[in-house]
Interface confidence: medium
């Protein structure tokens, strides 16, 4: 069976017809390239006025307009609110109340793309395997990203959140126009991978939502981790606006001027520092969500009666903090080279600023408890690394659940650990599951691409798969078309319950209070330490191009300030970030 | 690198004050505790107080209470330790000595102050 | 306060030899460093939470213990290791042991 034209909000749309065999039977309809809205340049979105005729939706778009990996140029357009959409089919009626899953891209909120890292038109983000393996429909969508996507003044001239209303405006036009492909717009599951999952978490918790999603997956991010939320947009609005010569002193006269400028200029007018800086390299993402009052009414950890009826499940990789720690302290990945207690001190630090010296003291301490039992550079590198994943994904991920199980009335809860370890051959032996390490499995491409992968790759694909379609179709991970190698039980705040997802799952992957002692660190000792109060006003980043960075503007609200990027860094971006 | 110099020797009269400097340089000043040790002739070590250098907050030891003072110039990365009321007993070398990392030991030493309290 | 006693108050070895100096916590502390000092010269670090070596100090010095008891041991004396060494506790108000002073026998 096969949809043919499609009529939607905005006119008819035609995909392609794939058959899954050459013997016939099974297909998948996929459409790629359908509008679902228009956005002006730092402007809100605005629904898609439509088309004549029939659109023939067989090819990606452009991805919206991006820094390239080496920050030096620029690629794809403004013109990027497209979607595109996988619906499995079966031999003789074409499907129909279908659940559905929308993904959300990660990419630090700078870059990425619906369809993801292409090789040999092989795409990262292909629906295919998801949706044919789990009788769902997969949407994905393109979002802006970087300046054009969340540059804000912390006021109404220029609000910010823009990529964040590009993501509603999908999720609200799937609502409306997936019956038509077969889905249940009843049945919406919205599911991401680190700022993507961010995105997903900050999406359940905004009022615009409401009555719109169903559940929700959150790979490797949070609304509450501390990359999420810019506690300065002026700041960043001021270090883009002097860039490309628009004022600075009235925020409705730089919005204007910001506005008519060149968003090519705009793009480029930012760079993330991939260099080992002062901070922690997180610390200097710029163009990310804002609490505007209006969209993100107030800080997230105050929001979570809004998910009181959507299933939840959240997760993270076992050493998600790898790719970070390369960067902030490059020793980790090199054999020949050492990590020093410095070099973590100065770490440490940079993410506890709020509380000052008696933070970063008890943070190192408790970190570094076993190096005096166990003073290998193997031990050094690996706490460097379980530092970063607990910082910037499994702290804020542990309070997310709690929040999420505390305030939940239909809502039920999951957590997991994905522990399957990294396949780059140039990691250290005793690498584990890196961030975005997961993205492959849960994408099938053990079963897309089965001759770069082992069998335990595909087993681990083919687990992922099925606990996350299950939960889509029925909010059980355990309940579904799909067969699961075991059960997984909810999440409760007494036991703090979660899968552990590796090559074996069997009934002793169902594990408990994952890093409790770290965690009641962070959730008390350290939460108690008074917060220090920055000596310096907000300063603006150096006229010239050298190297000397200023001093982050100093905010008590947050937990650690953001730092001004440096133009002189040039360096190339890690190709697999997928934060 | 790192590096901690200390203002020059004092004779000081039973009585008085003594106000001894530590100039830190070679590391973010505010980032690590800064403590002062003394030794006086052929004894042991005695820990007197610290600093935060960032804020300005101190603990002192009981033994010294009352009597030390210790405070810091940000502008200058330099802590002070004055010691009032100074008795005979109170000759020694006064050491300033930053913290390793974290809350560990004193990894970073001044090179010492000598305080002779003669009348 | 924590009290730190220190044995021997002095010893005398050789070049070469195996030399132990213990240090007694009242009461137990979970971590102790120990420091080098040599006359008219500030004190050094040598070994800290209780078993860890700064970079530049020699893989001869190690350490050990937990609780009450705590050791220092020079697996092979040197010349330059000939100086007197303190305990030391760290808590919110630290304090040392009275210390160890190495001659040449």
């Known amino acids: 069976a096969k949809l043919g034209a499609v009529y939607t909000e905005g006119g008819f749309v035609e995909g392609v017809n794939k058959k899954l065999s050459l013997l016939g039977g099974d297909s998948v309809d996929i459409f790629k390239g359908i509008p679902f809205a228009t956005a002006k340049t730092l402007e809100n979105p605005q629904r898609h006025p439509g088309w004549q005729g029939t659109l023939k939706a067989t090819n990606f778009k452009k991805r919206c307009l991006q820094a390239t990996i080496t920050q030096d140029n620029t690629y794809g357009q403004e013109d990027c609110l497209y979607l595109n959409i996988w619906v499995p089919q079966g031999r003789k009626q074409v499907s129909h109340n279908l659940p559905v899953m929308v993904w959300i891209y990660g990419g630090a909120f700078l870059m990425g793309s619906g369809q993801g890292a292409n090789f040999l038109k092989n795409y990262l983000y292909d629906g295919e395997e998801i949706a044919t393996r789990g009788n769902v429909i997969v949407v994905t969508f393109n979002y802006r990203v970087g300046p054009l996507g969340f540059l804000s003044t912390g006021d109404a001239n220029l609000p910010g959140n823009f990529g964040l209303r590009d993501q509603h405006m999908a999720i609200a036009w799937v609502k409306r126009n997936i019956a038509a492909f077969g889905g249940d717009p009843d049945n919406i599951t919205i599911f991401g991978e680190s700022a993507g999952a961010a995105s997903v978490s900050l999406q359940t918790l905004s009022p615009y939502n409401k009555g719109l999603i169903r559940r929700a997956i959150s790979q490797s991010g949070m609304a509450l981790s501390p990359w999420a939320i810019q506690k300065n947009p002026l700041f960043w609005a001021k270090t883009i606006a002097k860039k490309v010569g628009c004022p600075t002193e009235d925020t409705g006269k730089m919005a204007a001027c910001l506005k008519i400028t060149d968003p090519r200029a705009l793009t480029l007018a930012y760079k993330l520092p991939v260099k080992k800086q002062e901070y922690p390299v997180v610390h200097y993402l710029a163009f990310i969500p804002v609490i505007d009052g209006d969209f993100i009414p107030d800080d997230p950890i105050n929001l979570y009666n809004n998910t009181a009826d959507i299933d939840y499940i959240a997760g993270i990789n076992n050493m998600d903090g790898h790719l970070f720690a390369t960067i902030d302290v490059p020793a980790v990945d090199k054999t020949k080279q050492t990590v020093t207690e410095e070099d973590f001190y100065r770490l440490v630090s940079g993410h506890t600023v709020a509380k000052g010296l008696k933070g970063a003291q008890a943070t190192f301490d408790i970190y570094t408890e076993s190096w005096a039992q166990d003073p290998s550079q193997e031990n050094m590198k690996k706490t460097v690394v379980a530092f970063e994943t607990d910082v910037l994904f499994l702290i804020p991920t542990e309070i997310a659940l709690a929040q999420h199980k505390a305030h939940a009335k239909s809502a039920k809860t999951y957590s997991y650990l994905f522990s399957h370890p990294s396949r780059m051959p140039i990691y250290p032996k005793w690498m584990g599951a890196d961030h975005a390490d997961d993205l492959q499995y849960v994408f099938g491409k053990p079963f897309a691409t089965p001759l770069g992968y082992r069998p335990q790759d595909r087993a681990v694909s083919k687990a992922m798969i099925a606990y996350w379609t299950n939960f889509a179709r029925s909010g059980d991970p355990n309940m579904g078309n799909s067969p699961v190698p075991t059960h997984w039980y909810p999440y409760t705040l007494e036991n703090g319950n979660y899968l552990d997802i590796t090559k074996t799952i069997t009934s002793a992957s169902m594990k408990e209070h994952l890093r409790e002692k770290f965690l009641k660190f962070w959730a008390v000792t350290f939460e108690v330490l008074p917060t220090v109060t920055g000596d310096q006003d907000t300063l603006t980043p150096p006229e010239d191009d050298s190297e000397v960075a200023p001093d982050p503007p100093s905010d008590d609200s947050q937990v650690v300030p953001v730092p001004p990027t440096d133009d002189s860094v040039e360096a190339q971006m890690p190709a697999t970030i997928g934060f | 690198q790192v590096q901690l110099v200390q203002s020059g020797a004092e004779v000081k009269k039973p009585g008085a004050s003594v106000k001894v400097s530590c100039k830190a340089s070679g590391y973010t000043f505010t980032s690590y505790n800064m403590h002062w040790v003394r030794q006086a002739p052929g004894q042991g070590l005695e820990w007197m107080g610290v600093?935060?250098?960032?804020?300005?907050?101190?603990s002192y030891a009981q033994k010294f209470k009352g009597r030390v003072t210790m405070t810091r110039d940000t502008s200058t990365s330099t802590v002070y330790m004055e010691l009032s009321s100074l008795r005979s007993e109170d000759t020694a070398v006064y050491y300033c000595?930053?913290?390793?990392?974290?809350?560990?030991?004193?990894?970073?030493w001044g090179q010492g102050t000598l305080v002779t309290v003669s009348s | 306060d924590i009290q730190m006693t220190q044995s021997p108050s002095s010893l005398s070895a050789s070049v070469g030899d195996r030399v132990t100096i213990t240090c007694r916590a009242s009461?137990?502390?979970?971590?102790l460093n120990w420091y080098q000092q040599k006359p008219g010269k500030a004190p050094k670090l040598l070994i800290y939470?209780?078993?860890r070596l700064p970079s530049g100090v020699p893989s001869r010095f190690s350490g050990s213990g937990s609780g009450t008891d705590f050791t220092l041991t020079i697996s092979s004396l040197q010349p330059e290791d000939f100086a007197t060494y303190y305990c030391?506790?760290?808590?919110?108000?630290?304090?040392f042991g009275q210390g160890t002073k190495l001659e040449i026998k």
């Open positions: 030391q506790q760290r808590s919110s108000s630290p304090t």
């Open positions: 600093i935060n250098p960032g804020d300005g907050a101190t």
């Open positions: 000595a930053r913290d390793y990392y974290g809350s560990s030991p004193l990894g970073y």
């Open positions: 009461p137990s502390i979970s971590y």
């Open positions: 939470a209780t078993s």
